[in-house]
Interface confidence: low
Amino acid sequence: NLSQDDSQPWTSDETVVAGGTVVLKCQVKDHEDSSLQWSNPAQQTLYFGEKRALRDNRIQLVTSTPHELSISISNVALADEGEYTCSIFTMPVRTAKSLVTVLGIPQKPIITGYKSSLREKDTATLNCQSSGSKPAARLTWRKGDQELHGEPTRIQEDPNGKTFTVSSSVTFQVTREDDGASIVCSVNHESLKGADRSTSQRIEVLYTPTAMIRPDPPHPREGQKLLLHCEGRGNPVPQQYLWEKEGSVPPLKMTQESALIFPFLNKSDSGTYGCTATSNMGSYKAYYTLNVNDPSPVPSSSSTYH
């Protein structure tokens, strides 16, 4: 004795990415010598058994048996979303519905609002926007490996009434370590299946210079040639250098090159040297105390840096 449910067809809801292919499968245990039929949300018959009813080359027959009717829809569009009905024309007619949800793929995000010539301690605000997602995507920000906490994602319906444009902004104070950093806006959405869809904005930060004096060789001796390199860092890189020997009033101005050269070291060269590195962002003075060692082979570390 067959129960009434044996003639009730069953199917399942399906989710498909726009442009993808969805398979609609309808099954029935007892077909009562009747054929299965699929129709679309507009109630147009797609297939009746193995007979195509709608001229749409995207729709193909996958399986047609007395117990199953499966069809595929390729290149699915957002307009294809809705309830598809599987019917079996028993007495009475029995139906099962499959909700096809079409995911809209978010476009690659666009970052706007970057202003060049950021200075250290300035506040930067960047905006990010991505259109075409369904349901609405989520945007996240990061700077290198560090997550940035932007505003909550704002959602706006696209003109097509089906997809969404999402936007977010992030505000942060820049430091010299941020010079050359990439600020990345990533879009997170189920249609991407974990794939990364992001846009980066490289930022430049202007900051005051620093400098360090490096002796070459590191342990200078009497009679040797010595180069004191004034290594300036900054953005922009320091273009002007001024070497002075301390102790004389005014300090003895020696050269405006980045390296101070002693062709043949004398004991009288001992003393404290200052290098001022200058860019249009400011100046920085580094010091180095030179103690000229005897020409013996025993290394000494009596030279000191400031």
Epitope: E81, E83, L99, K134, P135, A136, I155, F164
Partner: nanobody
């Protein structure tokens, strides 16, 4: 501009009933799922009930099963929450929410649009 407006809250005695309404404007919401959440003072927002776009699929929190009924009238772009046998523990602000999707979700992260909420107080 999308707007969800809840109404129907108020003060009711234990064992009493209330019917909350959630009217949507600014877009066609009939194609989208809808959910009700609530937040009691000092507690996190919690799921109450949800309904899919057609009204054919509903889901309830354990605390709402058998007492609350969610329904919708797509012609009026409105979703309802019929609450019977109310208890003091049901006291909370009740929020209506809609996802940018046809599918109902059972957690707050699945919803993109939220109403301002309506206060329900159950007290004798």
């Amino acid at each position: 501009q999308v707007q969800l407006v809840e109404s129907g809250g108020g003060l009711v005695q234990p064992g009493g009933s209330l019917r909350l309404s959630c009217a949507a404007s600014g877009r066609t919401f009939s194609n989208y799922a809808r959910g009700w959440f609530r937040q009691a003072p000092g507690k996190e927002r919690e799921f109450v009930a949800a309904i899919d776009y057609s009204g054919g699929s509903t889901n309830y929190a354990d605390s709402a099963k058998g007492r609350f009924t969610i329904s919708r009238d797509n012609a009026k772009n409105t979703v309802y929450l019929q609450m019977n046998s109310l208890k003091p523990g049901d006291t909370a602000v009740y929020y209506c929410a809609a996802p940018a999707s046809r599918r109902p979700s059972w957690d707050a992260d699945g919803y993109d649009y939220w109403g301002q909420g309506t206060q329900v107080t159950v007290s004798s």
